[in-house]
């Protein structure tokens, strides 16, 4: 059976397509090609008489067609109007006709797309943004990329208009992008330049750094305030409720105890109209803001119950500190046998009993800081009594 095949089936605009003929009868008188699904002289492309090798162009001939002796038809520089069906009619030598119909599809070489947006400066949690991939072309697949990744599944992302429009519902600051759209058809693909969103947000609750609360007199107090915000926040400082300055940094040299108080950072975003504040307490004191870790020592760690005594000592180089003791998470002393001495640096247990076995540690502290020692384990043994022979004479 006579058949035709398009090579290729999907053709890029401007390229060429060959309508190949299979199972062409051996003895032919002539053949004709037609645009469409039937023999129609109004749509004849070319008629070809084998014997005379004479080609007669028809009304559908554009000058871009070449017919070959094997009945194949080459169409060059194809346009989208060339898309469709093509019918070959062959006149066999016995004057019997045969027909075959084939088709191909012409697709444009796609241009570089671009992204248009209905709102390039949306406000976080308030605005929606619709991106549209331009241009609109027929037989085209539209794809979207965010941060070079295909679209995540999200209820805030909606595709419409044949995937040509991407809508972000209730934008967040993480939706800045970049966004790219890609257009595809069977013969070409092209991706837009990236587009980023300028999401207006904030300010968030400010953070004051450093986090230190305690300062020694004579030190410099340097505080910095930061609140996530777009556009960047405008900052101002208040001390004990009194406005100081409109800067992000607050610097007070050579502080005294009089500089103790509440320090407020005020962040403002003029676009969103939102304000946020954070209050930090600053204490200026001679006391060490950081107490070093104390060391704990025992006169012995393994003792005999009801016989031995033991001394535990807590050592620290810090001054102006207090010491307290803990045993099994309980504060000591917890019995008459436990005594504290030398400003609580020494814990004496006399005599040691079985219930005194376990973990001990000490803690040093001042009004603004504290630190614990590593734990120490006290083991309590009891000597075994010699057994008497209780056997009666036999």
């Amino acid at each position: 059976q006579l058949t035709t095949e398009s090579m290729p089936f999907n053709v890029a605009e401007g390229k060429e397509v060959l309508l190949l003929v299979h199972n062409l009868p051996q003895q032919l008188f002539g053949y004709s090609w037609y645009k469409g699904e039937r023999v129609d002289g109004n749509r004849q492309i070319v008629g070809y008489a084998i014997g005379t090798q004479q080609a007669t162009p028809g009304p559908a001939n554009s000058g871009r067609e070449t017919i070959y002796p094997n009945a194949s038809l080459l169409i060059q520089n194809v346009t989208q109007n060339d898309t469709g069906f093509y019918t070959l009619q062959v006149i066999k030598s016995d004057l019997v006709n045969e027909e075959a119909t084939g088709q191909f599809h012409v697709y444009p070489e796609l241009p570089k797309p671009s992204i248009s947006s209905n709102n390039s400066n949306p406000v976080e949690d308030k605005d929606a943004v619709a991106f549209t991939c331009e241009p609109e072309t027929q037989d085209t697949t539209y794809l979207w990329w965010i941060n070079n990744q295909s679209l995540p599944v999200s209820p805030r992302l909606q595709l419409s208009n044949g995937n040509r429009t991407l809508t972000l519902l209730s934008v967040t600051r993480n939706d800045t992008g970049p966004y790219e759209c890609e257009i595809q058809n069977p013969v070409s693909a092209n991706r837009s330049d990236p587009v980023t969103l300028n999401v207006t947000y904030g300010p968030d609750t400010p953070t004051i750094s450093p986090s230190d609360t305690y300062y020694r007199p004579g030190a410099n107090l340097s505080l910095s305030c930061y609140a996530a915000s777009n556009p960047p926040a405008q900052y101002s400082w208040l001390i004990n409720g009194t406005f100081q300055q409109s800067t992000q940094e607050l610097f007070i040299p050579n502080i005294t105890v009089n500089n103790s108080g509440s320090y407020t950072c005020h962040a403002n975003n003029s676009v969103t109209g939102c304000n946020r504040t954070t209050v930090k307490t600053i204490i200026v004191t001679e006391l060490s803001p950081v107490v070093a870790k104390p060391q704990i020592k025992a006169s012995k760690t393994t003792v005999t119950g009801d016989k031995d005594s033991v001394n535990l000592t807590c050592s620290t180089n810090d001054t102006g500190i207090s010491i307290r003791w803990f045993f099994k998470n309980q504060s000591l002393p917890s019995s008459e046998r436990m005594k504290l001495s030398q400003g609580n640096t020494t814990l004496s247990i006399n005599p040691v009993k079985r219930e005194d076995a376990g973990t001990y540690w000490c803690e040093v502290f001042n009004p603004i800081s504290k630190n614990q020692s590593d734990p120490i384990m006290l083991n309590v043994n009891y000597n075994a009594l010699p057994q008497e022979n209780g056997l009666s004479p036999g």
Epitope: Q27, F29, G30, S32, V39, D40, G41, N42, R43, Q44, V46, G47, Y48, A49, I50, G51, T52, Q54, T56, G58, P59, I91, K92, S93, D94, L95, V96, N97
Partner: antibody, heavy 120, light 106 residues
Framework: QVQLQQSGAELVRPGTSVKVSCKAS????????IEWVKQRPGQGLEWIGV????????NYNEKFKGKATLTADKSSSTAFMQLSSLTSDDSAVYFC?????????????WGQGTSVTVSQ | DVQMTQTISSLSASLGDRVTISCRAS??????LNWYQQKPDGTVKLLIY???RLHSGVPSRFSGSGSGTDYSLTISNLEQEDIATYFC????????FGGGTKLEIK
């Protein structure tokens, strides 16, 4: 130049047969078709059939199947039409014509015609 | 089968006239229409094929047009030698002729 020379006029009895010839010259005989056309006195043209001299393939008007038989002799570049079982209805001038293909068919050169008279 | 009809069987015209002869097909023949001239001596010539294409050697005063089922032959400047009968013919697998239009001088 292209010429189609037909045989002379025929006077024949009813019920007999007649064979009209058409000798082609001035072109390659086997690469065109030969068509046969009937014209009764004072009437229009009526297509009888066509032959491909290169292959002997034929196509007939349904009305003339069994009446006309088309043949061709490549060696003498001559086409023939035999009409059988003649009646007075067969009295006419018969033309042969060369036909070429352009997607359809057109008869571009014609013979001078052969008059066949069927009479007692 | 496709029937071809030439409704005007004869017409008279003066030399120099523009003459149009019409032909109708019983169905769309897709421009596969030919025109023939038969002189009074019986000789037949192809004038136009494929509706509007002039056969070689035919004077340019002859032209053809039409589409679908309606076709026409026009002689733009009638000459004495154009006195003849004109036949249309559809050129599909089974050819058929119109009844003819006889052109005479007034």
């Amino acid at each position: 130049q292209v010429q189609l020379q037909q045989s002379g006029a025929e006077l024949v009895r009813p019920g007999t047969s007649v064979k009209v010839s058409c000798k082609a010259s001035g072109y390659a005989f086997t690469i065109y078709l030969i068509e046969w056309v009937k014209q009764r006195p004072g009437q229009g043209l009526e297509w009888i059939g066509v032959i491909n001299p290169g292959s002997g393939g034929t196509n007939y008007n349904e009305k003339f199947k069994g009446k006309a038989t088309l043949t061709a002799d490549k060696s003498s570049s001559t086409a023939f039409m035999q009409l059988s079982s003649l009646t007075s209805d067969d009295s006419a001038v018969y033309f042969c014509a060369r036909s070429y293909y352009y997607g359809s068919f057109a008869m571009d050169y014609w013979g001078q015609g052969t008059s066949v008279t069927v009479s007692q | 089968d496709v029937q071809m009809t030439q409704t005007i069987s004869s017409l008279s015209a003066s030399l120099g006239d523009r003459v149009t002869i019409s032909c109708r097909a019983s169905q769309d023949i897709g421009n596969y229409l030919n025109w023939y001239q038969q002189k009074p001596d019986g000789t037949v010539k192809l004038l136009i094929y494929y509706t509007s294409r002039l056969h070689s050697g035919v004077p340019s005063r002859f032209s053809g047009s039409g589409s679908g089922t309606d076709y026409s032959l026009t002689i733009s400047n009638l000459e004495q030698e154009d006195i003849a009968t004109y036949f249309c013919q559809q050129g599909n697998t089974l050819r058929t002729f119109g009844g003819g239009t006889k052109l005479e001088i007034k």
